[in-house]
């Protein structure tokens, strides 16, 4: 069965010897009792450490209390509370405890004192030239002005490089947008409609303010 | 607007003492640790230490351990005193701000680890 | 504690142009990596933070990346008013339990 010095009885760092009714409690200097537990220690020995505001106590059985300082706990402020245990760091950061204070370090993609900025939603992101941050699954990109492509809008796009004019028509970049003069047969912003030859065409009725033809802005 | 003002440089002997003073206005002391820099003519900045404001915590390079103190002298300013000066601790010395966060909840500060405001710096000159 | 070292010492490019500024640190710092820009006269101003965050108030023609042990500042569309020293800086912690800043050596940028 269970020895009597099992789970170590002796408190205030007593060590525990077993006799043969039961077992007897060795304890350390300033401490008295069955189980240590009755400390003969004032103020006035300075028995807290790591800075801890020793203050007398209010009854015979605890001679002295020991309020303890940021980062440290036990009855005598002796052990380190490890702070980065309760993963105050966000997002996979590295919890570093300076003692008086504590500092993430951030995973790639996030920022902040607790690691808590995503760098990849547009709360961090900056597009140049007039871009704006789109977001969607999980990721952002930015949506740039005319002129301008790449991941942050900063170098300079021919908006005619992607051959937007459909049906062999010819493609000029304009300063509102880009405008596409159709091969004969063909009419649209993209020259994308062709017309019929009773003169229809298969053009949907145009948006307020747009005629067929007109750079789209 | 914030700000920070250093003072107390000037010319100084070798083996001499000097204390200078860093004054802060226009934003909240706490939740900042104020440091000091310094730069010698022509080199990068050097770190020497610094004070968190909140529990008055003092930290320096391993180098400036022993000559250079920092002290929080009240509750907008601090200071740097220095001990046995020689001719190589002549330099422009920098007052600087490295904000702290605090959250609801949290079990602590969390520091930023860099300087997001500097003061103007005040020139150390020793020479006999 | 950390060691910071700064390429080129020195760097030269045309008004509208680019330069690029390469930090390398002795250890893994993940992501804590400052920027400073430094005209005479004047002390170091903070650029960015957390190796790609600008600061309130510099123009996005002012970029950080990297992560680890190497870091970049790449300005672009360089005006005359971008010509001064960029200095990086992280901060240390060693096993020891102390707690510290260091910067690099810096970069001065010419422009033409």
């Known amino acids: 069965g269970p020895g009597p010095c099992d789970g170590n009885p002796c408190a205030n760092g007593g060590s525990c010897s077993e006799t043969p009714r039961s077992f007897e409690c060795t304890c350390p200097r300033g401490f008295y009792g069955l189980r240590c537990e009755v400390s003969g220690v004032t103020c006035a020995d300075g028995p807290c450490f790591n800075g801890g505001l020793c203050v007398g106590g209010a009854d015979p059985d605890s001679a002295y209390i020991c309020h303890c300082p940021p980062g440290f706990q036990g009855s005598n402020c002796e052990k380190r509370v490890d702070r980065c245990s309760l993963q105050p760091c966000r997002n996979g950061g590295l919890c570093l405890d300076l003692g008086h204070a504590l500092r993430c370090r951030c995973r790639a993609g996030f920022a902040g004192p607790r690691c808590e900025h995503d760098l990849d939603d547009c709360a961090g992101r900056a597009c140049a030239n007039g871009g704006t941050c789109v977001e969607g699954g999980g990721a952002h990109r930015c949506s740039c002005a005319l002129g301008f492509g790449g991941r942050d809008c900063r170098e300079r796009a021919d908006p005619c490089a992607a051959r937007p004019c459909a049906h062999g028509g010819r493609c000029y970049a304009h300063f509102s947008g880009l405008v596409c003069a159709c091969a004969p047969g063909y009419m649209g912003a993209r020259c994308e409609f062709p017309v019929h030859p009773d003169g229809a065409s298969a053009l949907p009725a145009a948006p307020p303010g747009l005629r067929p033809g007109d750079p789209q802005r | 607007q914030e700000q920070l003002v250093e003072s107390g440089g000037g010319l100084v002997q070798p083996g001499a003492s000097l204390t200078l003073t860093c004054k802060a206005s226009?934003?909240?002391?706490?939740?900042?640790?104020m440091c000091w820099v310094r730069q010698a003519p022509g080199k990068g900045p050097e770190w020497i230490a610094c004070?968190?404001?909140?529990?008055?915590?003092a930290y320096s390079a391993s180098w400036a351990k022993g000559r250079f103190t920092v002290s929080k002298t009240s509750s907008t300013a601090v200071t740097l005193q220095v001990t046995g000066l020689t001719a190589a601790d002549t330099a422009t010395y920098f007052c600087?701000?490295?904000?702290?966060?605090?959250?609801?909840?949290?079990?602590?500060?969390?520091?930023?680890?860099?300087?997001?405001?500097w003061g103007p710096g005040t020139l150390v000159t020793v020479s006999s | 504690d950390i060691v910071m070292t700064q390429t080129p010492a020195s760097v030269e490019a045309a008004v509208g142009g680019t330069v690029t500024i390469k930090c390398q640190a002795s250890e893994n710092i993940y992501n804590s990596l400052a920027w400073y820009q430094q005209k005479p006269g004047q002390p170091p101003k903070l650029l960015m933070h957390?190796?790609?965050v600008l600061t309130s108030g510099v123009p996005s023609r002012f970029s950080g990346s990297g992560y680890g042990t190497e870091f970049t500042l790449t300005i672009s569309d360089l005006e005359c008013a971008d010509a001064a020293t960029y200095y990086c800086?992280?901060?240390?912690?060693?096993?020891?339990?102390?707690?510290?800043?260091?910067f690099g050596g810096g970069t001065e940028v010419v422009v033409k």
């Open positions: 800086q992280s901060d240390y912690y060693s096993t020891g339990g102390s707690y510290g800043f260091a």
């Open positions: 957390d190796a790609s």
């Open positions: 226009g934003f909240d002391f706490t939740s900042n640790a």
């Open positions: 600087a701000r490295s904000p702290y966060y605090t959250y609801g909840g949290a079990p602590s500060a969390y520091a930023s680890g860099y300087f997001n405001l």
């Open positions: 004070i968190y404001n909140d529990d008055g915590s």
